[in-house]
């Protein structure tokens, strides 16, 4: 394991009289990013597959605006290497494609217009561990500079990242047969014994005994080219028999996604989100124009007629993606307030908005008790969003229509027993209990702990709650 | 204006070596690359190497790897090569070009040299 | 390394004549070509690179086209100072390779 990193040193005008002007002007303040694609170089079918290596984009540069009459300068640059991580060996030989993308930040209808302002590409060796090589490049008019370098991860080491450096278990020198891990000269190479029988061109090993294959080759030592055609379930067949790749415990393990895409799981499978300029199920289709219709549900490609000349999509309503083809889940960002339950019918989003509430996005409180009456003498009173009736005694329910059980909740105290009365209800209090409720004792001295009680009532006698 | 001017036609004996040089003018010599190419009479154009001037890396065809030796002073902004153990198969007309790793802009008017014993 | 293979090695054509040549790559090199013009005892000269880009000086006779394996330069109304020999140049991978040069004469 390691990281391809990519230094960008400059972008310009190319020497000589026909250099272009800047790419941003006054009206069209700029800012550049930059795209490295990386791929295996050593066959055509690897060199073919897009980004196979990995893919990253920069950071955007600073904003940069032309100097009306003054001769376009090299421009200014994103901060920081563009990093490339790979899991397994490092190929030795590998081809890269270089973008130089332009982002206008004038007044761009539905936010910044990206556009291609150049593209490189070359096959190189690179060994792993070296120092920074260096390119200049031309592409049209402009001219780009730039270094790159692959570096292990410890504790891989060597050219290819495939041997392992341990701390060294004895102060003084390695173990038998191992040398000090240059440059790391306090640690010792790892002694790496590969399962016997490991194909020495597509396997290597980090761990002793194991087999790890190179891209394009499965099995249990590396022998048997992968198949994709019976490989295209993600948890398709996986003996070694068949020629397939062997799915990790997840459909995400690996990064199916070519080019830099993202993958995320979903019930059945995975799901890749693609970098603009890809698409397919494993963003694997690049080289893509207007002419090849790559913008789905109904999308508006604006690009250009060649290969070079990126394209963008403009997405319909409710969908979203460089290609439009994911569908929005509009609902998941909540959009109906007040509780409203929200309804993605494609073409437009709807709210069906809970009691009291209106509006598209049920943002309007109504008056509650606007046109809402209260049977058999409740009151309505307002708030939380829906009208309440206050009802009126022996009724109950949302609009006081259900006649209500007054002794229902139990509510003399004491061991009284309740009694339902037109009016409401009456507790017969239990020897030495009185009020309404039962709920005050009475003394032995027969005062009560209240004012005394109404003339015509004996303590004892049932009191009649009014 | 840029200029490449290359040193005179060389005449050498088989086995021995000889050194020309290209005396770079007109634009920044460290900024870009000078690359040699060599000609045989009558055939097409073959890639030795290249020079970095900034760094003095080089990078060889792997046909030259073993004849041919590039330096380059930033004091003169001249680049040189060398070629050892020549042979007859080594005469041609020897150009050196500035240039980036996906073009040759400028090239020298070329050196001539020819193995004879 | 990658194969240049140029053709035709020869042709003539008469003043106001269009002219092609073509260039094959053994593989892929994506637009990574350039074109040279080497007159009778000069040296090479820069015409065209990454496949359709036009040197500065160049006149606008010279054009070049193409993608993937297959590239051409095409002189539109051909002159008398156009009488040189033709190289094509590929920077896709080191080493770089010239095609074995298209030798063009007026009629």
């Known amino acids: 394991a390691g990281v391809f990193e990519l230094q960008i040193h400059s972008f310009g005008p190319g020497p000589g009289p026909g250099a272009p002007r800047s790419p941003c002007s006054a009206r069209l303040p700029c800012r550049l990013f930059f795209r490295v694609c990386l791929k295996p170089g050593l066959s055509e079918e690897a060199a073919e597959s897009p980004c196979a290596l990995g893919a990253a984009l920069s950071a955007r540069g600073p904003v940069y605006t032309e100097q009306p009459g003054a001769p376009a300068p090299d421009l200014p640059l994103p901060d920081g290497l563009l990093q490339v991580p790979f899991r397994d060996a490092w190929p030795g030989t590998f081809s890269f494609i270089i973008e130089t993308w332009r982002e206008e930040l004038g007044d761009q209808i539905g936010g910044p217009a990206w556009s291609l302002l150049a593209r490189v590409a070359g096959r190189r060796r690179l060994a792993a561990g070296g120092p920074w090589a260096r390119d200049i490049q031309r592409a049209g008019a402009w001219e780009l500079r730039f270094s790159y370098r692959a570096r292990c991860e410890p504790p891989a080491v060597g050219t290819a990242c495939t041997r392992l450096c341990r701390p060294r278990s004895a102060p003084s020198r390695c173990g038998p047969g191992l040398r000090p891990c240059a440059p790391l000269e306090d640690e010792c190479e790892a002694p790496l014994v590969c399962r016997a029988g490991c194909s020495p061109e597509h396997g290597f090993c980090e761990q002793p005994g194991e087999c790890r294959c190179l891209e394009g080759w499965t099995g249990p030592l590396c022998t048997v080219p992968v198949s994709t055609s019976s490989c295209l379930s993600p948890r398709g067949p996986s003996s070694a028999t068949t020629g397939c790749l062997v799915p990790g415990p997840g459909p995400c393990d690996g990064n199916p996604c070519a080019n830099g895409g993202s993958c995320s799981e979903t019930p059945r499978s995975f799901e890749c989100t693609c970098p603009r300029g890809f698409y397919g199920l494993r963003c694997e289709v690049s080289g893509v124009t207007c002419a090849d219709g790559p913008c789905f549900n109904g999308g508006l490609c604006v690009g250009g007629a060649d290969p070079d000349s990126a394209y963008i999509c403009h997405c319909p309503p409710g969908f979203q993606g460089s290609n439009c083809e994911k569908r929005v889940d509009r609902c998941s960002l909540q959009p109906c307030r007040n509780g409203g339950l929200c309804l993605d019918l494609g073409h437009a989003l709807r709210c069906r908005c809970r009691a009291g509430f209106a509006g598209p996005r049920c943002e309007h409180d109504l008056d509650d008790c606007a046109g809402r009456a209260c049977a058999n003498g409740g009151t309505c009173v307002e708030g939380g969003g829906a009208h309440r009736c206050s009802c009126a005694l022996g009724f109950g329910g949302r609009d006081c229509r259900e006649r209500a059980d007054p002794c229902a909740a139990r509510p003399c105290a004491h061991g009284g027993r309740c009694y339902a009365h037109f009016s409401g209800l009456v507790c017969a209090c239990a020897p030495g209990y009185m009020g309404a409720r039962c709920e005050f004792p009475v003394h032995p001295d027969g005062a009560s702990a209240l004012p005394a009680a109404p003339p015509g009532l004996r303590p004892g006698d049932p009191q009649r709650y009014l | 204006q840029v200029q490449l001017q290359q040193s005179g036609a060389e005449l050498a004996k088989p086995g021995a070596s000889v050194k020309m040089s290209c005396k770079a003018s007109?634009?920044?010599?460290?900024?870009?690359?000078i690359h040699w190419i060599k000609q045989r009479p009558g055939q097409g154009l073959e890639w030795i190497g290249y020079?970095?001037?900034?760094?003095?890396?080089?990078e060889f065809n792997q046909n030259f790897k073993d004849k041919a030796t590039l330096t380059a002073d930033k004091s003169s902004t001249t680049a040189s090569m060398q070629l050892s153990s020549l042979t007859s198969e080594d005469s041609a007309v020897y150009y050196c070009?500035?240039?980036?790793?996906?073009?040759?802009?400028?090239w020298g008017q070329g050196t001539t040299l020819t193995v004879s014993s | 390394d990658i194969q240049m293979t140029q053709s035709p090695a020869s042709l003539a054509a008469s003043v106001g004549e269009t002219v092609a040549i073509t260039c094959r790559a053994s593989?892929?090199?994506?637009?990574?070509l350039a074109w040279y013009q080497q007159k009778q005892g000069k040296s090479p000269q820069l015409l065209i690179y990454?496949?359709?880009s036009l040197e500065d000086g160049v006149p606008s006779r010279f054009s070049g086209s193409g993608s993937g394996t297959q590239y051409s330069l095409k002189i539109n109304s051909m002159q008398p100072e156009d009488s040189a020999t033709y190289f094509c140049?590929?920077?896709?991978?080191?080493?770089?390779?010239f095609g074995g040069g298209t030798k063009l004469e007026i009629k």
């Open positions: 070009a500035r240039g980036g790793s996906n073009f040759f802009d400028y």
């Open positions: 007109g634009y920044t010599f460290t900024r870009y690359w």
């Open positions: 020079i970095n001037p900034t760094t003095v890396y080089t």
């Open positions: 593989e892929n090199i994506y637009y990574n």
């Open positions: 990454t496949a359709n």
């Open positions: 140049k590929q920077a896709y991978d080191v080493p770089p390779t």
